[in-house]
């Protein structure tokens, strides 16, 4: 229903704490360079204004849209042009163009230093002094580095953070309590970020229909006992929630997500038998839990898919009558039977089925033409299954770091023009798929691997879009989202690439590497590996292994030496010579 004051409506629905958190996230995602204090001031002003509207919905400006109110606040920031350049031009536009302009200026790779975690004692001190400010800093720092982070989910992670600090700061050994727990939250939050970015990309590039198809497949896998009408309703609502969050309408998004969670918990009987545990939790935990709830048990008596979609005489008639509904029921029926497939694969199968009907229903004898469609799915299913087997075997053999290196070599050969930091980031993320998915039961591996890889490759595409350098990458990124992963997998060595000349300084290291944390050491070594491949794109795995082993040995020796600096300056040049010889 329409409300006299949108801001009062949202404040009442969400409550002050969530309202303030969401406004802070919104501002931090739009203006990524502003400090926490600048944003906190704006948030307080907006909150005070919302309270006046709650007291009197007819008060001045209370009838304005949220975009107008928030946009006016952002545009009133001093030195906007100095700090944000052409983003300031957005302020010359009217709504809704102004908000669209802000969205277009969101930066997926802002030049901000990595978010460093303070040491335990300092963290606990500032948390105890002012928990609200501490959590505000967390929201601000994450939101500005991840401008499409799913806002209500970020509130959930902040709540997790809060609970961990409350528990661990009371312990004697704060460090060993905090580190593993916060690392776990960070890992989950980073995965959540790339997954949500993929959803926003789907929405931005291919529209609501594409996202809704994704949702139908995903929901049908999770709730195989729900009927098509129920799945369609959930998919429609989920599409609305994601459209709002991707569009910067974070208050509406969080409010609608809470409504959807409420609806699901009130209608468990027609959705799934697995929801009760989630529904017993408070709001943020409930919505999070529902988003990753285990699959319900599949009905035992499902007829073969062929009955309605191949053998039925009415296939083309049903398709003609309502294409989207018929394809939607196909996607629903196929997905509920295959929780062991990735959503990307299910969407490829639905696309293949659609293409088959488009071709066959135009023929004189359609049944003879589409009769073999299910058999034609086989290669599409085998390809990702083989990918999972090959990569999990490799991961089990090499471990995470070695697996990342194998991927780094492979992707540097596919797209050597891409910057080394981007290749290293991508390979490290892609390599984590092993730890994340290869340890799962067989029937969960494929969906885990492929949907995770698709999300990571989406980030590769977004970064490459900013500065396109590789035709290979451009080709894979300009196709449909579900075809990206197979496209990247099929890429081979880029024959057009002119190898980089060998620069000794690229492979020159100093004693400061010895004191770096393990992760930073790995990144340094992986940077060198990517540069080696750029110098010799056709180097064999054996040659690269020889060089990297030598390099590891060199680091080990010099880092243990009494006079590290001398070791690095004398042994370093010898290492460079040996590397050149090994790759000659």
């Amino acid at each position: 229903e329409a409300h006299k004051s949108e801001i009062a409506h949202r404040y009442n629905d969400l409550g002050e704490q969530h309202f303030k958190g969401l406004v802070l996230i919104a501002f931090s995602q739009y203006l990524q360079k502003c400090s926490y204090d600048e944003h906190a001031k704006l948030v307080q002003e907006v909150t005070d204004f919302a309270k006046t509207c709650v007291a009197d919905e007819s008060a001045a400006n209370c009838d304005k849209s949220l975009h107008t109110l928030f946009g006016d606040k952002l545009c009133a920031i001093p030195n906007l042009r100095e700090n944000y350049g052409e983003l300031a031009d957005c302020c010359t536009k009217q709504e809704p163009e102004r908000n669209e302009c802000f969205l277009q200026h969101k930066d997926d790779n802002p030049s901000l230093p990595p978010f460093e975690r303070p040491e335990a004692e300092a963290m606990c001190t500032s948390f105890k002094e002012n928990p609200t400010t501490f959590m505000g800093h967390y929201l601000h720092e994450v939101a500005r580095r991840h401008p499409y982070f799913y806002a209500p989910e970020l509130l959930y992670y902040a709540e997790q953070y809060n609970e961990i600090l409350t528990q661990c700061c009371a312990e004697a050994d704060k460090e060993s309590c905090l580190t593993p727990k916060l690392d776990g939250v960070k890992e989950k939050a980073l995965v959540s970020s790339v997954r949500q970015r993929m959803k926003c990309s789907s929405m931005q590039k291919f529209g609501e229909r594409a996202f809704k198809a994704w949702a139908v497949a995903r929901l049908s896998q999770t709730f195989p006992n729900a009927d098509f009408a129920e799945i369609t309703k959930l998919a429609t609502d989920l599409t609305k929630v994601n459209k709002e969050c991707c569009h910067g309408d974070l208050l509406e998004c969080a409010d609608d997500r809470a409504e959807l969670a409420k609806y699901m918990c009130e209608n468990q009987a027609t959705i799934s038998s697995k929801l009760q545990t989630c529904c017993d939790k408070p709001l943020l935990k409930k919505a999070h839990c529902l988003s990753e709830v285990e699959h319900d048990t599949m009905p035992a008596d499902l007829p073969a898919i062929a009955a309605d979609f191949v053998e039925d005489q009415e296939v083309c008639k049903n398709y003609a009558e309502a294409k989207d509904v018929f394809l939607g029921t196909f996607l629903y029926e196929y997905s509920r039977r295959h929780p062991d497939y990735s959503v990307s694969l299910l969407l490829r199968l639905a696309k293949k089925y659609e293409a088959t009907l488009e071709k066959c229903c135009a023929e004189a004898n359609p049944p003879a033409c589409y009769g073999t469609v299910l058999a034609e799915f086989q290669p599409l299913v085998e390809e990702p299954k083989n990918l999972v087997k090959t990569n999990c075997d490799l991961y089990e053999k090499l471990g995470e770091y070695g697996f990342q290196n194998a991927i780094l070599v492979r992707y540097t050969q596919k797209a050597p023009q891409v910057s080394t930091p981007t290749l290293v980031e991508a390979a490290r993320n892609l390599g984590r798929v092993g730890t994340k998915c290869c340890t799962l039961p067989e029937d969960q591996r494929l969906p885990c691997v492929e949907d995770y890889l698709s999300a990571i490759l989406n980030r590769v595409c977004l970064l490459h879009e900013k500065t396109p350098v590789s035709e290979h990458v451009t080709k894979c990124c300009s196709g449909s989202l579900v075809e990206r992963r197979p496209c990247f997998s099929a890429l081979t060595v880029d024959e057009t690439y002119v190898p980089k000349e060998f620069k000794a300084e690229t492979f020159t290291f100093h004693s400061d590497i010895c004191t770096l944390p393990e992760k930073e050491k790995q990144i340094k070594k992986q940077t060198a590996l990517a540069e080696l491949v750029k110098h010799k794109p056709k180097a064999t795995a054996e040659q690269l292994k020889t060089v990297m082993d030598d390099f590891a040995q060199f680091l080990d020796t010099c880092c243990k030496a009494a006079d590290k600096d001398t070791c690095f300056s004398t042994e370093g040049p010898n290492l460079v010579t040996r590397c050149k010889d090994a790759l000659a």
């Epitope: 005489q313 009415e314 296939v315 083309c316 008639k317 398709y319 003609a320 009558e321 488009e358 229903c361 135009a362 023929e363 004189a364 004898n365 359609p366 049944p367 003879a368």
Partner: nanobody, 115 residues
Framework: EVQLVESGGGVVQPGNSLRLSCAAS????????MSWVRQAPGKGLEWVSS????????LYADSVKGRFTISRDNAKTTLYLQMNSLRPEDTALYYC????????SSQGTLVTVSS
């Protein structure tokens, strides 16, 4: 909403001709193959003829081959069946259908061949 409306049926003597029409609406006509099926009194549905969406490809039941011609006008979204040398056994309700469908989703048009 898909609509198929047949017309052109009637009573004719054996050896004569009739031309049936089927006006289609509610879907992309040119993207779909179309068929004629018939149901003689007290019998089941029998497939008669089919044509591809472009009109370039046609198929006929042995019982009508050489006597009937299926065609279409995609601009008018209309399907036709030219029936020559009609026989008493061609007496039936004739339906047009989408794709290879053997079903009656329309009223049909009655063809009676009798001396």
């Amino acid at each position: 909403e898909v609509q198929l409306v047949e017309s052109g049926g009637g009573v004719v003597q054996p050896g004569n001709s009739l031309r049936l029409s089927c006006a289609a609406s509610g879907f992309t006509f040119s993207s779909f193959g179309m068929s004629w099926v018939r149901q003689a009194p007290g019998k089941g549905l029998e497939w008669v003829s089919s044509i591809s969406g472009s009109g370039s490809d046609t198929l006929y039941a042995d019982s009508v081959k050489g006597r009937f011609t299926i065609s279409r006008d995609n601009a008018k979204t209309t399907l036709y069946l030219q029936m020559n040398s009609l026989r008493p056994e061609d007496t039936a309700l004739y339906y047009c259908t989408i794709g290879g469908s053997l079903s009656r989703s329309s009223q049909g048009t009655l063809v009676t061949v009798s001396s």
